[in-house]
């Protein structure tokens, strides 16, 4: 009987040869639990494990605790991988980060952040960052050191209100921090003066709602 | 760790100024207002006013206008609250505490209401001829 | 200008429940926050928006409100609860705060 093969990440799809865009399955580290992600294959040398992205507004992203535990939304639109498996993933080797956006003006930026990882989810998938490059601002967006993550149903913030309450969405939030990709998604023209949008603070400023966003992990040594 | 130290005990004649500084370390002093709460002796707390460290605005209760002026130097993490024409009754602990400005990254001019999470220790003024 | 009011004192024996109360104007439609003040030292939230608690604070300390009274509840008090209580909430009208006159806990022995 033919051995199945199994892959923990876009990294080990691509390098077994397939090298088009798509979603594929992954199997958890250590495990034979699989998840379905999206892989980018051509950006940047490809092999990029796309773990969240929004696009057009159709997936609510106000969600539980466990719902971004486990990941939810289409992986070949809008989704969330999902905490637990990154946080596996991360936890296995060393992982880069990085987050392609899109304004509604047609300018597009980066932040590559040269180490990433999510903490379990027993330290409530904290998230760790080091080495920001990249043109989506010199200060980065995402509160450093890393906040606890947060839902509508497990406040961990550093804020004496309810971030992902007010702001929407699940994120790492600070009190309440410069960041939030899980927010509302506003159209064109109603995508300014929003305190609960779609914001990379130090690439568009207050209010900002962005168009699309694309967060993607990749092994450091890929 | 988080913490607002506030400057020393002040012994003022009536009519004179004194000016309370408020030291802020381990957060970001512009993410947070800063309010003043009183103490008299034996009495129970009274707000005075904030200020809003990212942009300077302040708020004062209407008891204080045109005796209170609120300032802060960002470049040393400090708020300042100065009380003008002093009378024998602003006797009290002056407290300097703060609140999340959670739209901060937001809508900067936005207040939200949230309740003071971390206090000074307080100064003492006493106002005594 | 708005007015919260509070007893002056409440007495409770240890390992018995204290309630504070803090009345006002429609108060059910305002957040309320609790603030512990033992003597010689500066206030400490214990209780915001209405029944949360900040981080350190022990569970036995709850919070209500609804109608024209907020409520502070203390579970099994203990001799270190001794403190006057200090309820506060956000008056819109005027954007100024305002603080209940307090209650002092006094757990008898």
């Known amino acids: 009987k033919e051995e199945q093969i199994s892959f923990r990440d876009c990294a080990e799809v691509f390098k077994s040869g397939h090298t088009t865009n798509g979603i594929y399955t992954l199997t958890f580290p250590n495990s034979t639990e699989e998840i379905k992600a999206y892989c980018d294959m051509e950006a940047g040398g490809g092999g990029w494990t796309i773990i969240q992205r929004r696009e057009d507004g159709s997936v609510d992203f106000q969600r539980t605790w466990k719902e971004y535990k486990v990941g939810f939304g289409n992986p070949s639109g809008e989704y969330w991988l999902g905490n637990e498996f990154v946080s596996q993933l991360t936890n296995q080797q060393r992982y880069v980060l990085k987050i392609h956006l899109k304004d509604w003006e047609g300018n597009e930026a980066y932040s590559l952040y040269e180490h990433f990882y999510l903490s379990s989810e027993e330290l409530n998938y904290r998230i760790h960052l080091k080495g920001l490059t990249g043109t989506a601002g010199k200060i980065s967006s995402i509160s450093q050191p890393g906040n606890d993550f947060s839902t509508k149903d497990g406040d961990n913030d550093k804020c004496i209100c309810k971030c992902s309450q007010m702001l929407t969405g699940g994120w790492w939030f600070d009190a309440c921090g410069p960041s939030n990709l899980n927010g509302m998604y506003y159209p064109q023209r109603q995508n300014t003066n929003k305190f609960n949008g779609i914001k990379w603070y130090y690439w568009k400023g207050s209010g900002y709602s962005l168009k699309a966003t694309t967060m993607m992990i990749r092994p450091a040594d890929f | 760790q988080v913490q607002l130290v506030q400057s020393g005990a002040e012994v003022k004649k009536p009519g004179a100024s004194v000016k309370v500084s408020c030291k802020a370390s381990g957060y970001n002093f512009k993410g947070y207002y800063m309010h003043w709460v009183r103490q008299a002796p034996g009495q129970g707390l009274e707000w005075m006013g904030w200020?809003?460290?990212?942009?300077?605005?302040?708020n004062y209760a209407q008891k204080f206008q045109g005796r209170v002026t609120m300032t802060r130097d960002t470049s040393i993490s400090t708020a300042y609250m100065e009380l003008s024409r002093l009378r024998s009754d602003d006797t009290a602990v002056y407290y300097c505490?703060?609140?999340?400005?959670?739209?901060?990254?937001?809508?900067?001019?936005?207040?939200?209401?949230?309740?003071?999470?971390?206090w000074g220790q307080g100064t003492m003024v006493t106002v005594s001829s | 200008s708005y007015v919260l009011t509070q007893p002056p004192s409440v007495s409770v024996a240890p390992g018995q429940t204290a309630r504070i109360t803090c009345g006002g104007n429609?108060?059910?439609?305002?957040?309320v926050h609790w603030y512990q003040q033992k003597p010689g030292q500066a206030p400490v939230l214990v209780v915001y928006?209405?029944?949360d608690r900040p981080s350190g604070i022990p569970e036995r300390f709850s919070g209500s409100n609804s109608g024209n009274t907020a409520t502070l509840t203390i579970s099994r008090v203990e001799a270190g609860d001794e403190a006057d209580y200090y309820c506060q909430v956000w008056d819109s009208s005027s954007d100024h705060w305002v603080f209940g006159g307090g209650t002092k806990l006094t757990v008898l022995s």
């Open positions: 928006d209405d029944s």
């Open positions: 200020i809003n460290p990212n942009s300077g605005g302040t």
């Open positions: 505490a703060r609140s999340p400005n959670p739209y901060y990254y937001d809508s900067p001019g936005y207040y939200y209401p949230a309740a003071f999470d971390i």
């Open positions: 429609n108060i059910g439609s305002k957040s």
